[in-house]
């Protein structure tokens, strides 16, 4: 029955650390019975492996079948539309999915106050799917960096930025009081990976946190 259906216009990965999601755009005028077949190719093993015969969503979680991503040459994925006995041509991801494509995140940020300083501790991601030995700090073992952004609330869109090279950091508030909110964006200096801003953590600074010294 050939290739009567149009192909998905685009296919791409959106990945965080051990959270590898394949996305695609729907074919135009798809019917209620249209679904999508997903296949995966691991570089070095030059054959396509069928992952899902009929996904009715526009994304598929490939984490479980790409757990070795961080120790491999990467993957390509392809998707085609299926409707009954008809199917489209395959649409293949146009870039190799490798560790370089993983967007870096932090798990959370903890804040406390000490003598007018905001002290922060960055918790690294600990995804459930990750094998025990594949921690964030073992895979990205060197040159971890973090952009820290702080804003005073209420306020508008004004952030003050600072770059740090450790999971622990301190911020001087210049004697100001009020609520301060912090977001963190990770990077690795030796890599090209993008980073995502963390969830905002806020802390209230009042006069009681300042020690008077002569």
């Amino acid at each position: 029955h050939g290739t009567e259906l149009p192909s998905p216009p685009s296919v791409w990965f959106e990945a965080e650390f051990f959270h590898h999601i394949l996305h695609w755009t729907p074919i135009p005028n798809q019917s209620e019975s249209t679904c999508y077949e997903v296949a995966l190719l691991r570089y070095g093993i030059e054959s396509w492996n069928s992952i899902s015969n009929c996904s009715q969503t526009l994304s598929y979680d490939l984490t479980a079948v790409t757990l070795d991503l961080y120790h491999s040459n990467g993957y390509r994925a392809r998707v085609r539309a299926v409707d009954g006995s008809r199917h489209s041509n395959w649409t293949v991801t146009n870039t190799r999915f490798s560790v370089d494509e993983v967007t870096l995140t932090v798990g959370s940020v903890n804040l406390e106050i000490h003598n007018g300083f905001i002290l922060g501790k960055i918790q690294l991601p600990r995804p459930k799917m990750a094998p025990a030995n594949d921690t964030y700090e073992s895979i990205f073992s060197h040159f971890r960096e973090y952009e820290i952004a702080i804003r005073k609330v209420p306020g508008n869109f004004t952030f003050t930025h600072k770059k740090v090279k450790h999971e622990n950091f301190s911020l001087l508030t210049s004697g100001e009081v009020g609520e301060f909110c912090v977001q963190v964006k990770p990077s690795v200096a030796s890599r090209s990976n993008k980073g995502m801003w963390s969830k905002e953590e806020c802390i209230s600074l009042t006069r009681q946190y300042f020690t008077v010294t002569n």
Epitope: G107, F157, Q183, K199
Partner: nanobody, 127 residues
């Protein structure tokens, strides 16, 4: 590739209304910080409003609170800025921006930086 396409700008009298649209394509839409920014001639770009597309929370600059409303249509991958009671000082080029947020760990809006920007749409308010 990611594309943000703004529309809906134009010229209007003071007190009038406009509705700007920003259509997102090229990446998934489920968890992002989407923002509207503006830049008047000779001035720095300033934030106007943001929306968290996953949670729906919104944030506004003081100068537009009560007059502007940011909203989303998930089915159309589109974010809107409804601008009412427009003033001459609202005259500017308006830009749509997007920053992906973590699906695993969440994120907040506004983000300190935005990675994707549209080309802008001009809004002119005359007195």
């Amino acid at each position: 590739q990611v594309q943000l396409q703004e529309s809906g700008g134009g010229s209007v009298q003071a007190g009038g209304s406009l509705r700007l649209s920003c259509a997102v394509s090229g990446y998934s839409y489920s968890s992002n910080c989407m923002g509207w920014f503006r830049q008047a001639p000779g001035k720095e770009r300033e934030g106007v409003a943001t929306i968290h597309t996953g949670g729906g929370s919104t944030y506004y600059a003081d100068s537009v609170k009560g007059r502007f409303t940011i909203s989303q249509d998930n089915a159309k991958n589109t974010v809107y800025l409804q601008m009412n009671s427009l003033k001459p000082e609202d005259t500017a080029m308006y830009y749509c921006a997007a920053e992906p947020l973590s699906r695993l760990y969440g994120g907040s809006c506004p983000t300190p930086t935005f990675g994707y920007w549209g080309q802008g749409t001009q809004v002119t308010v005359s007195s």
